[in-house]
């Protein structure tokens, strides 16, 4: 080609720079060139051409459009060091080439072994102490700092100086005693030396005494006891003036006494005794153990058809045994165990706290709240009851047996099976390559049960055939490829159902999250052929109007289906696979709803939050006195915006000595919460109560206030 007047040879306008980078980290060597025509760029390391993704798509080096060389991660071993070296970029066009300056790529290094570890030092209080250290070899050369008891030392304190590798403490105090660690650091990271102990002689004294504690049963508790002395005092613990029983207690290196899970028998007085040859000191503290209510069995969300009976379990424990009661969200009515059943009421609570609702109606749908109450606290759990109407929740048709891929001979006969079921009974139609079939072709007919027959096959009959089963509840399709050749079989192999594995059992739901459902099932009944694998199909009215295959080649009878939508009802069925084909489907699972997603907390538009909160209307119901010192507050919300973190229940005394005292708050920190229990109230006192929605620091409008007077004695049931 001729030299064009405006063309010019390459020149490098941005040269690569030396770089030091940690192993495994990304980095870029820059290179930019000008020239006409635009030059091509290649890189060389130590004189050899560098392979990039242009040569091998799996390469960890990428040649960027700008000409820069990008390393996804620096590869560097003890011996193999393919990325370290001296790089140049070369820009070429037909007029010549330009070579950049050399740029070295060095891999930062920090070895593990210290050239000199600090050693233990013993000094008397008031004397100077010197700790020496030489960090590990590294590139760049590491610097050092010191830690005492895992906390970095501030060398601005006038008694402390750090020069080279030496830590010098003048005029030591007993508080200087501890474990000193030298830390070598560079861009790779940090390495800690072996710790060295600095001992400063002293008589036993307490730096930290144990303090009295009140805990809930099963909580961990720690009694601290920090001492110092010269020589180091021995520290031991006693309980109620006796040695500690073995096994229940864990004494840490800093002499902290820890009980992992407290029991009521752990109550008592704990004494820390510090002793050395020059003295003995004792410090004690008491432990009080309370047992708040706890759920043994929580109620769970259930989906039930009209007319059925549902039971929500709610078993609790605590000390004392909690009082359990139920309430439907939005209702003032409380249900207690052993309450005589009201005429026409279909709800009852068993002595163990289970709520049973008979002859389920649509109006029963909603959230049911189980609450447990003791002096040690209160808890509540919510479960949603969804009521389904069998007629409106019909799944789409199910294709029991669909067509199989097959290769047949010219002039042969094809039989493409399609057997479907459903309520209402589906209509079967066929498509070829997505278009209605058979049209007017007399060679093709759809037989009574839906099988497509094509006689006198031609090469042009090759293609993808799709059986579509359609009803008012949706449609389901199944495709197969027909290949017509000179050498195929003359007629379709008619698989007997006995060649196929039996259908698996009804899948059971064993776990549910926002985006997944875990299913388990049993293989087909004994006597049927075994399965080599399974497929799982799913249907959700809110996702599509057809069954979707959500898992293939499943080798086990327990499987977690992922990628589901939150807060969505799904049905599942399972088919078994063997080399001959697919079984009939299993029975459908019970409907299951995935968990709801929590509202987003980060990255929100504050104006939008404030606007939405301002539109929330909270309606406070009449508070209910549960005991002389506890009141239940319930409310409803006209519209639940995206941005709500919870509700602030505000209450104050309006009678008695502290009338119109300041507001006290109780936060219901769950956006879906619609009730709260106020505890530790005064007997026979009137309270004003209101509820306010909130999100982070933003707050919505208060509900109207309600007043309630606590009783002098327990209210009768």
């Amino acid at each position: 080609s001729r030299l064009r007047q405006e063309d010019f040879p390459p020149r490098i306008v941005e040269h690569p720079s030396d770089v030091i980078v940690s192993k495994g980290e990304p980095t870029t060597l820059n290179c930019k060139a000008e020239g006409r025509p635009t030059p091509t760029i290649e890189w060389y390391k130590d004189g050899e051409r560098v392979e990039t993704d242009k040569d091998d798509p799996r390469s960890h080096r990428m040649l960027l459009p700008s000409g820069s060389l990008f390393f996804l991660r620096i590869v560097h071993g003890r011996r193999s060091k393919p990325d370290e070296g001296s790089y140049v970029c070369v820009a070429r066009n037909y007029l010549g080439e330009a070579v950049s300056r050399n740029a070295s790529l060095e891999v930062a290094l920090l070895r593990d072994d210290f050239r000199q570890n600090p050693t233990d030092v013993v000094v008397a209080a008031g004397e100077p102490a010197i700790l020496e250290c030489q960090p590990p070899r590294g590139h760049p050369e590491p610097t050092i700092y010191w830690k005492k008891d895992k906390v970095r030392i501030d060398d601005k304190e006038e008694r402390i100086s750090i020069r080279g590798g030496k830590l010098m403490i003048s005029n030591t105090r007993k508080s200087d005693a501890g474990m000193y660690t030298c830390v070598g650091t560079n861009m790779v990271g940090e390495r800690d030396s072996d710790p060295a102990e600095l001992t400063v002689f002293e008589r036993p004294t307490f730096l930290r005494r144990p303090i009295n504690q009140v805990v809930l049963e099963e909580e961990a508790v720690e009694f601290r006891c920090q001492v110092q002395g010269d020589p180091q005092p021995t520290v031991r613990w006693k309980k109620d003036d006796a040695d500690l029983p073995r096994g229940r207690y864990d004494i840490k290196d800093d002499y902290t006494l820890r009980i992992k899970k407290t029991m009521s028998t752990d109550e008592g007085t704990y004494m820390c005794i510090a002793e050395n040859r020059v003295g003995k000191m004792e410090a004690s503290a008491t432990l009080t153990v309370r047992a708040p209510p706890q759920f043994v069995v929580r109620p769970r969300d259930q989906i039930v058809a009209q007319g059925r009976t549902v039971t929500f379990p709610c078993e609790t424990k605590g000390n004392p045994q909690p009082a359990v009661f139920w309430q439907k969200e939005g209702s003032q009515n409380l249900l207690f165990p052993n309450q005589p059943q009201q005429p026409n009421s279909r709800c009852s609570v068993s002595p163990t706290g289970d709520l049973t609702i008979t002859n389920i109606q649509r109006s029963d749908a909603g959230y049911y709240i189980c609450q447990a109450l003791t002096v040690a606290g209160s808890i509540l759990a919510k479960a949603q009851l969804e009521v389904t109407d069998v007629l409106t929740d019909r799944p789409p048709p199910i294709i029991l047996q669909g067509p199989a891929n097959q290769t047949l001979a010219v002039d042969g006969t094809a039989l493409l099976k399609c057997k479907a079921t459903g309520d209402p009974l589906p209509v079967i139609s066929w498509l070829k390559e997505g278009f209605t079939f058979p049209g007017r072709d007399p060679r093709a007919t759809i037989q009574e049960q839906g099988t497509l027959q094509i006689k006198n096959l031609r090469i042009s009959d090759t293609g993808t055939y799709t059986c579509v089963a359609t009803s008012s509840s949706g449609e389901t399709s199944w495709s197969a490829v027909l290949d017509v050749t000179e050498s195929g079989a003359t007629i379709s192999k008619n698989y007997d159902l006995s060649d196929l594995p039996g259908p698996p059992s009804k899948p059971q739901v064993t776990d549910v999250t926002k985006n997944s459902v875990t299913l388990s099932w049993q293989p087909g009944t004994p006597g049927t052929l075994p399965a080599s694998a399974y497929i799982i199909e799913a249907f959700s009215q809110s996702v599509s109007n057809s069954w979707q295959t959500v898992a293939n080649h499943v080798k086990t009878t327990l499987y977690t289906v992922r990628g589901l939508r939150p807060n969505t009802i799904y049905l599942f069925m399972v088919r078994a696979i063997n080399p001959q084909g697919l079984s009939d489907p299993s029975p459908m699972s019970d409907p299951v709803r995935t968990q709801d997603i929590s509202p987003p907390a980060q990255g929100v538009d504050h104006r939008q939050v404030q606007k939405e909160l301002g539109d929330v209307l909270v309606r406070l119901h009449n508070p209910v006195v549960l005991t002389p010192t506890t009141v239940q507050v319930t409310w409803t919300v006209d519209r639940q915006p995206q941005f709500i973190q919870g509700y602030r229940v505000m209450y104050r005394q309006t009678s008695g000595l502290q009338a119109t005292s300041s507001w006290q708050n109780l936060d219901a920190k769950v956006p879906t919460e619609r009730s709260a229990v106020l505890v530790n109230l005064k007997k026979g006192v009137t309270y004003e109560i209101k509820v306010r929605p909130y999100f982070n620091e933003f707050q919505g409008m208060d509900s109207e206030s309600k007043t309630v007077r606590t009783t002098e004695e327990a209210p009768s049931a």
Partner: antibody, heavy 118, light 105 residues
Amino acid sequence: QVQLVQSGAEVKKPGASVKVSCKASGYTFTGYYMHWVRQAPGQGLEWMGWINPKNGDTEFPQKFQGRVTMTRDTSITTAYMELSRLRSDDTAVYYCARESGDDAFDIWGQGTMVTVSS
Amino acid sequence: DIQMTQSPSSLSASVGDRVTITCRASQSISSYLNWYQQKPGKAPKLLIYAASSLQSGVPSRFSGSGSGTDFTLTISSLQPEDFATYYCQQSVGLFFGGGTKVEIK
């Protein structure tokens, strides 16, 4: 793609030498150490040493020093392992293997069977 | 030289079993340990490097753990294709363990 291809099987007499080649392709030959490992029939893996293709440096365990030579030809991206003064207990499959930047042998040759028999 | 001791030398197991193989170094090798699988007539294949990192393309049922002198290779649910011999290798001095043959029970 990245691969190592070794020379074919050899039959040698005791006292002779054998030279096995290992042709590397699909990566920068000089960027990765090459190791040799052998496996006698029914036995485990035995490391024989390495060569740095960049500069020809080598290292061998005590057992093989003086009997094994490792070389390379960067122009044809090939490594060689020569074992001299062969004995019957040198009968084994000899493998070359590339050492990755993660200090492991990530790519192996297909192996070369060397039989030493009188 | 740092010696590598692998145990057991062989074991019988069934498909679906959890299998554990151990490897002990005669002195600390930090996390410089690799695991390989070898099938008869084939070259070894890298499974785990740096004691616990899974090599690209290796099924997640294989896992490695340990540091210092004691290391473990675990196959969480043995598959038919997993019956083979497994070797540990320390990447400081590059010596291999004696191997563990996993056979069908």
